[in-house]
């Protein structure tokens, strides 16, 4: 079976205040079974940005329909970008577990930074 890879193609994403940013993430395998979550940062302060299963994320939408069985695209859009949104974003695969899911593999991260203001 093919080993799962987490692909975040952009190392750097320049965004504009007030606009919508798209953070890309695709996986190369449907296995292991379990969700893909989005985080900002690493370590103790790692912040949950999107979890399809629980929570309220009013500014985040998915690019694809995550409920489709064969979906391998876990990209997200973040609307109404502000300077507080800068940082490095990671899509992270969890393996289904009991009682809790276990982190399996992280993408390499995409750094979101502010680009030039629109003229």
């Amino acid at each position: 079976e093919e080993e799962l890879q987490m692909i975040q193609p952009e190392k750097l994403l320049l965004v504009t205040v007030g606009k919508t940013a798209t953070l890309h993430c695709t996986v190369t395998s449907l296995l292991p079974v379990g969700p893909v979550l989005w985080f900002r940062g690493v370590g103790p302060g790692r912040e949950l940005i999107y979890n399809q299963k629980e929570g309220h994320f009013p500014r985040v939408t998915t690019v694809s329909d995550l409920t489709k069985r064969n979906n391998m695209d876990f990209s997200i859009r973040i609307s109404s970008i502000t300077p507080a949104d800068v940082g490095t974003y990671y899509c992270v695969k969890f393996r289904k577990g009991s009682p809790e899911n276990v982190e399996f593999k992280s993408g390499p991260g995409t750094e979101m930074a502010l680009g030039a203001k629109p003229s």
Partner: antibody, heavy 117, light 108 residues
Framework: DVQLVESGGGLVQPGGSLRLSCTAS????????MSWVRQAPGEGLEWVSA???????YYTDSVKGRFTISRDNSKNTLYLQMNSLRAEDTAIYYC???????????WGLGTLVTVSS | EIVLTQSPGTLSVSPGERVTLTCRAS??????IAWYQQKPGQAPRLLIY???SRATGIPGRFSGSGSGTEFTLTITSLQSEDFAVYYC??????????FGGGTKVEIK
């Protein structure tokens, strides 16, 4: 407004146990890293433990195996279970919210833990 | 573990003076330094992060600078409410997160 309120401190004998609580409000608790930072009387700040927004846990070496950090997202509460307490654990224990790049943007007022016979 | 050394340990100054506090790291930390103010009987308060970014609500007289291993916190025209202990913290390496020993700014 972000608010962090610690409780559970007190006087305990060496070798004893104590559980600290930190109740949070004003932000989406489950999404963020939370931490405990302590300050011995008249001394500086020392990071103790943290629980990230993904539920991962982190400890400074001196408390590993003795302290356990946990959280109940449904109650917006962070805990620190402290076992095998030592005199050198005597300190004010602060609960702090951790930013995504690992500094502390909000702090509680602290709760005093005294380990003495 | 990254060790942070703050100097001086105590600084005696008069209101209105300009104050510069130093924090040195035992290795390069890519500008990942935060500064906190703590008054007696109170919790620390975030002043500066990423070496030079002011936290929300912090007055403009507080500024941070530095790179590599040496960082400074400057308070221009010290106010009476600025007498406190100031701590630096590195947020580069989180295993573990570490603080400096603090600098006490007291009234001359």
């Amino acid at each position: 407004d972000v608010q962090l309120v610690e409780s559970g401190g007190g006087l305990v004998q060496p070798g004893g146990s104590l559980r600290l609580s930190c109740t949070a409000s004003g932000f989406t608790f489950r999404n963020y890293g939370m931490s405990w930072v302590r300050q011995a009387p008249g001394e500086g700040l020392e990071w103790v433990s943290a629980s990230s927004g993904s539920g991962s846990t982190y400890y400074t070496d001196s408390v590993k195996g003795r302290f356990t950090i946990s959280r109940d997202n449904s109650k917006n509460t962070l805990y620190l279970q402290m076992n095998s307490l030592r005199a050198e654990d005597t300190a004010i224990y602060y609960c702090a919210k951790v930013t995504w790049n690992n500094f502390f943007d909000y702090w509680g007022l602290g709760t005093l833990v005294t380990v003495s016979s | 573990e990254i060790v942070l050394t703050q100097s001086p340990g105590t600084l005696s100054v008069s209101p209105g003076e300009r104050v510069t506090l130093t924090c040195r790291a035992s290795q390069g930390i890519a500008g990942k330094i935060a500064w906190y103010q703590q008054k007696p009987g109170q919790a620390p308060r975030l002043l500066i992060y990423d070496a030079s970014s002011r936290a929300t609500g912090i007055p403009g007289r507080f500024s941070g600078s530095g790179s590599g291993t040496e960082f400074t916190l400057t308070i221009t025209s010290l106010q009476s409410e600025d007498f406190a202990v100031y701590y630096c913290q590195q947020h580069y390496d989180w295993s573990p997160l570490t603080f400096g020993g603090g600098t006490k700014v007291e009234i001359k």
